[in-house]
Amino acid sequence: HYVRYNQKKTYNYYSTLSFTTDKLYAEFGREASNNFTEMSQRLESMVKNAFYKSPLREEFVKSQVIKFSQQKHGVLAHMLLICRFHSTEDPETVDKIVQLVLHEKLQDAVGPPKVDPHSVKIKKINKTETDSYLNHCCGTRRSKTLGQSLRIVGGTEVEEGEWPWQASLQWDGSHRCGATLINATWLVSAAHCFTTYKNPARWTASFGVTIKPSKMKRGLRRIIVHEKYKHPSHDYDISLAELSSPVPYTNAVHRVCLPDASYEFQPGDVMFVTGFGALKNDGYSQNHLRQAQVTLIDATTCNEPQAYNDAITPRMLCAGSLEGKTDACQGDSGGPLVSSDARDIWYLAGIVSWGDECAKPNKPGVYTRVTALRDWITSKTGI
């Protein structure tokens, strides 16, 4: 046999570092809040720059803040750090050099926040531990390069771990709607999914990229429909489903992030809608999860007479294309419309709600606007 000198080995570290900031901890301590994201981004950039200014530029893969904790003097950031070194390198030397780069190069870091380079501690962890930390963070996914897809109506199939928060809601064993995992015991879906069938005992939620076989299954304990939802109107089309027992987070199944109520997604933002729904109007649901790339359309355009003629309320958003190329369809209802931030963390922007047929010109998909109902979610779940 022969030695492959170009083979690389991944090194995963759990890292902590202290910093001070004039922001109150309460402002950024809550995971996935605007301030959490901003603070995380700053710290991750500092770490990235530390490596980029060192001989280890090629070895650095990524850093990700997973949480903050308060200290007597300042705040402790908990981060995952991933590097790749030639397999011939001595592991102990690698650990020392990584620690050294952080100690030395973080001294040049320009704040805010003000980082204490000498506070940096790193601990090597294995892949299983790394995955566990990542899976407990919201909005992380095993990314695959996302090609332009057509529609879920004819779009692209998904691989395991790509959209781990997607759930299928089944009534008496038959897929009826999509849903999104927002923590270990709660799903968010559309209110209209439960207008006919209400008994939670006969609903099940399954997880994974196929309905049969599924990765995981749970019964529902209860269903909460927004008090202002009135069928057949589409306004306030949101529901929550409590699982009979929590799901353990894995690479294939974990939660999405919920945006702050104040967050504004912008027209033109690229988003993804996923589901097990039909490939054409009035078609059959699919066993394998599909994805479609869509673009956020502003409410004014969507409310034009040739589109939805003022039917779009502040609790709704439109996404797709006015040409009718991409859309969700029957059976996708209740499922997620997601958008990623600069850190590649995914947020729930919308819930598949309604539309005039599927992928019809001038009739984009209409989604429940999650930010508009964010406080309602908190009031019912505490999330």
Partner: antibody
């Protein structure tokens, strides 16, 4: 308020069929399932089946398949149950019941009709 | 089918008594259990849903508890209008099934 008004008592010959009605008022008829429940004189309650008036979806207790047929008429907000090939075993009071709400925990059969007595006798 | 067993078919109690009626399921019904009251005139009313939730308009002297396969209905302070037959019912699995009933009488 929610009301379920059932049709009057029926006296039928063995082998005949009978159609019972349950007129709903005080709510949107298509929004809730209606179940039918049998109670033989001095006995307990037995679930026959249910109908979802929005799409006429029906679910039956295996024991009553072929005996009971559930239908619903949206225009008159009325649910019906037809019992066929009547025998003395079908002599009972039949109730219709509407499920409760879903803004929290599911309520089951929250509203009941007054019941219809069916007597089968030669 | 899930069998619901109410072992006490009738019980006698005095006004003001605390009365407990039990119900056992042949398998776990995951708290999807209701209690109904049927008055001597035949009218049926929902009392308790999802094991322990009081239906609107039902007096607070009624309460429910239990989990898994064992459930109970308690009337804390028996009143004359509580004379009725009480049925448990599971809605965890089709077909929905009822207990055989417990007839409550005044001593």
């Amino acid at each position: 308020q929610v009301q379920l008004q059932q049709s009057g008592a029926e006296l039928e010959r063995p082998g005949a069929s009978v159609k019972l009605s349950c007129k709903a008022s005080g709510y949107t008829f298509t929004s809730y399932a209606i179940s039918w429940v049998k109670q033989r004189i001095g006995q307990g309650l037995e679930w026959i089946g249910e109908i979802y008036p929005r799409n006429n979806d029906t679910y039956y207790n295996e024991k009553f398949k072929g005996k009971a047929t559930l239908t619903a008429d949206k225009s008159s907000s009325t649910a019906y149950m037809q019992l066929s090939s009547l025998t003395s075993e079908d002599s009972a009071v039949y109730f219709c019941a509407r499920e409760g709400d879903y803004y929290g925990d599911y309520e089951g059969f929250a509203y009941w009709g007054q019941g219809t007595l069916v007597a089968v006798s030669a | 089918d899930i069998q619901m067993t109410q072992t006490t078919s009738s019980l006698s109690a005095s006004l003001g008594d605390r009365v407990t009626i039990s119900c056992r399921a042949s398998q776990d019904v995951r708290n999807f259990l209701n209690w109904y009251q049927q008055k001597p005139d035949g009218t049926v009313k929902l009392l308790i849903y999802y094991t322990s939730r009081l239906h609107s308009g039902v007096p607070s002297r009624f309460s429910g508890s239990g989990s898994g396969t064992d459930y109970s209905l308690t009337i804390s302070n028996l009143e004359p209008e509580d004379i009725a037959t009480y049925y448990c019912q599971q809605y965890s699995n089709l077909p929905y099934t009822f207990g055989s009933g417990t007839k409550l009488e005044i001593k």
